[in-house]
C-alpha cells in the first residue's frame, strides 16, 4: 500500500473527524470484521462535531488489520504522546489507514497547529490544494493553490505544508496564504 | 458443534486451477472471520489466507497474493478458495478453520506433471 | 519462511513439565496478546491449546498453560502424559502477514 503523504489542509478537508488523542491501549483484531482496533483517548475535537452528533467521545480507531491492505501500525509505545488523526466515519467508527494523516502533535509545526485549529476550515469549501508532481504543472482553476513541496523535499517535510494554507483571496480565487501571520 | 469439512482437493498439474470448499456447520457462520491454512507434506503449518465475516475484507500471504482467491457464499455456511496459476510448492494439505479455533481435516492438494 | 522461532524438539518423562518456547518479534508476539498454541497428532488436523497468550479453550486439560514475556511466548505442559507426544506449533498475528506460525516442536514422552 502505496500513497502520497496529502497537504494537511487536504487531509484536514477531507476527514469526516479530525481529533486529537492519546493510543492508550493493546491493539485488538475483532475476529469478525478483521479490523485491527486501537483504544484512544481524545483530548480535542476539531472537525466531526455534527457528524458524530452527541456520540462525541471517541474510545477507538479502526484500521485493517494487514499492512498491505493499508492497515496503519502505531509504532510509537509513549501512552501520553498526543496525536493528530484525521480519519473517516463509517457506522459512527473512526477509520483510518495508511494513507491517513496521523501524526505526533509536538512534531507539527505552529502554523500546523493553527491549520487544524481554526484555519484550515476556512479554505474547505471553495479552495483546493493541488499537488504539483511533475514539471511543468498549471493551475487547473483560480480556487486551485499549486503544492510544488514534493519537487523539492518530502511532502510532509515542505515549506508548504508546515507553514502555508490555501484560503480564499477573493471570490473565485484562493492563494497561499501564511499561517505564521495569523498566529496572534 | 462446530464443524467443518474441507473437499475439492485432488491431483492437478503445474499452471492448473482448483477450487477448494468447506462446509461449516454448529455456529453462526457470517458471525465468524474465515482462514485457510496449509501444511506441505512432513513441513510445518503456512497460513494462506483470511476473510472477514462479511466477505468484504480479505488478506493473502505473499506466496499466494494474485494466484488464489478466497470467498464466502454466507448463505451456504461455505468457504471457497479458488487456486489458480498452481505450483509444485503448492502441494499441501489444506485446512479451513474459523479464525484459527476449529479446523477441519484438510483436503489434500497435489501439483505434479 | 519460518516467521517464529521454536526449537525443534523437546522431551520428558511422564510426570514431568515441559516447556516450549516460540520467540518473535516486536511486529508479532512482542506487539500483541494473539499468541496461540496448536497440538498435532500424526495425519490428524492442529488443535487449538491455548489462546490469547494464556486461555484455554473449554476441554483442554489444566496441564497445559501458556505465557509471555518480552517477544517470546511459551507453552508448559505439566504432569506429561504419553498422549502429549506429538507436534507442536505457535501461532502470533502479525500487522505484515496477518497471522504467522512457528516451525514446530516435536514433543516425545520418553
Known amino acids: 500500500c502505496t500513497c502520497v503523504p496529502p497537504h494537511p489542509q487536504t487531509a484536514f478537508c477531507n476527514s469526516d473527524l479530525v481529533i486529537r488523542a492519546k493510543f492508550v491501549g493493546t491493539p485488538e483484531v475483532n475476529q469478525t470484521t478483521l479490523y485491527q482496533r486501537y483504544e484512544i483517548k481524545m483530548t480535542k475535537m476539531y472537525k466531526g462535531f455534527q457528524a458524530l452528533g452527541d456520540a462525541a467521545d471517541i474510545r477507538f480507531v479502526y484500521t485493517p488489520a494487514m499492512e498491505s491492505v493499508c492497515g496503519y501500525f502505531h509504532r510509537s509505545h509513549n501512552r501520553s504522546e498526543e496525536f493528530l488523526i484525521a480519519g473517516k466515519l463509517q457506522d459512527g467508527l473512526l477509520h483510518i489507514t495508511t494513507c491517513s494523516f496521523v501524526a505526533p502533535w509536538n512534531s507539527l509545526s505552529l502554523a500546523q497547529r493553527r491549520g487544524f485549529t481554526k484555519t484550515y476550515t476556512v479554505g474547505c469549501e471553495e479552495c483546493t490544494v493541488f499537488p504539483c508532481l511533475s514539471i511543468p504543472c498549471k493551475l487547473q482553476s483560480g480556487t486551485h493553490c499549486l503544492w510544488t513541496d514534493q519537487l523539492l523535499q518530502g511532502s510532509e517535510k515542505g515549506f508548504q505544508s508546515r507553514h502555508l494554507a490555501c484560503l480564499p483571496r477573493e471570490p473565485g480565487l484562493c492563494t497561499w496564504q501564511s499561517l505564521r501571520s495569523q498566529i496572534a | 458443534q462446530v464443524q467443518l469439512v474441507e473437499s475439492g482437493g485432488g491431483l492437478v498439474q503445474p499452471g492448473g486451477s482448483l477450487r477448494l470448499s468447506c462446509a461449516a456447520s454448529g455456529f453462526t457462520f457470517s458471525s465468524y472471520a474465515m482462514s485457510w491454512v496449509r501444511q506441505a507434506p512432513g513441513k510445518g503449518l503456512e497460513w494462506v489466507s483470511a476473510i472477514s465475516g462479511s466477505g468484504g475484507s480479505t488478506y493473502y500471504a505473499d506466496s499466494v497474493k494474485g494466484r488464489f482467491t478466497i470467498s464466502r457464499d454466507n448463505s451456504k455456511n461455505t468457504l471457497y478458495l479458488q487456486m489458480n496459476s498452481l505450483r509444485a510448492e503448492d502441494t499441501a494439505v489444506y485446512y479451513c478453520?474459523?479464525?484459527?479455533?476449529?479446523w477441519g481435516q484438510g483436503t489434500l492438494v497435489t501439483v505434479s506433471s | 519462511d519460518i516467521a517464529l522461532t521454536q526449537p525443534a524438539s523437546v522431551s520428558g518423562s511422564p510426570g514431568q513439565s515441559i516447556t516450549i518456547s516460540c520467540t518473535g518479534t516486536?511486529?508479532?508476539?512482542?506487539?500483541?496478546?494473539?499468541v496461540s498454541w496448536y497440538q498435532q497428532h500424526p495425519g490428524k488436523a492442529p488443535k487449538l491449546m491455548i489462546y490469547d497468550v494464556s486461555n484455554r479453550p473449554s476441554g483442554v486439560s489444566n496441564r497445559f498453560s501458556g505465557s509471555k514475556s518480552g517477544n517470546t511466548a511459551s507453552l508448559t505442559i505439566s504432569g506429561l502424559q504419553a498422549e502429549d507426544e506429538a507436534d507442536y506449533y505457535c501461532q502470533s498475528y502479525d500487522f505484515r502477514r496477518f497471522s504467522v506460525f512457528g516451525g514446530g516442536t516435536k514433543l516425545t514422552v520418553l
Open positions: 478453520a474459523r479464525f484459527f479455533d476449529y
Open positions: 516486536s511486529s508479532d508476539v512482542g506487539g500483541y496478546n494473539y
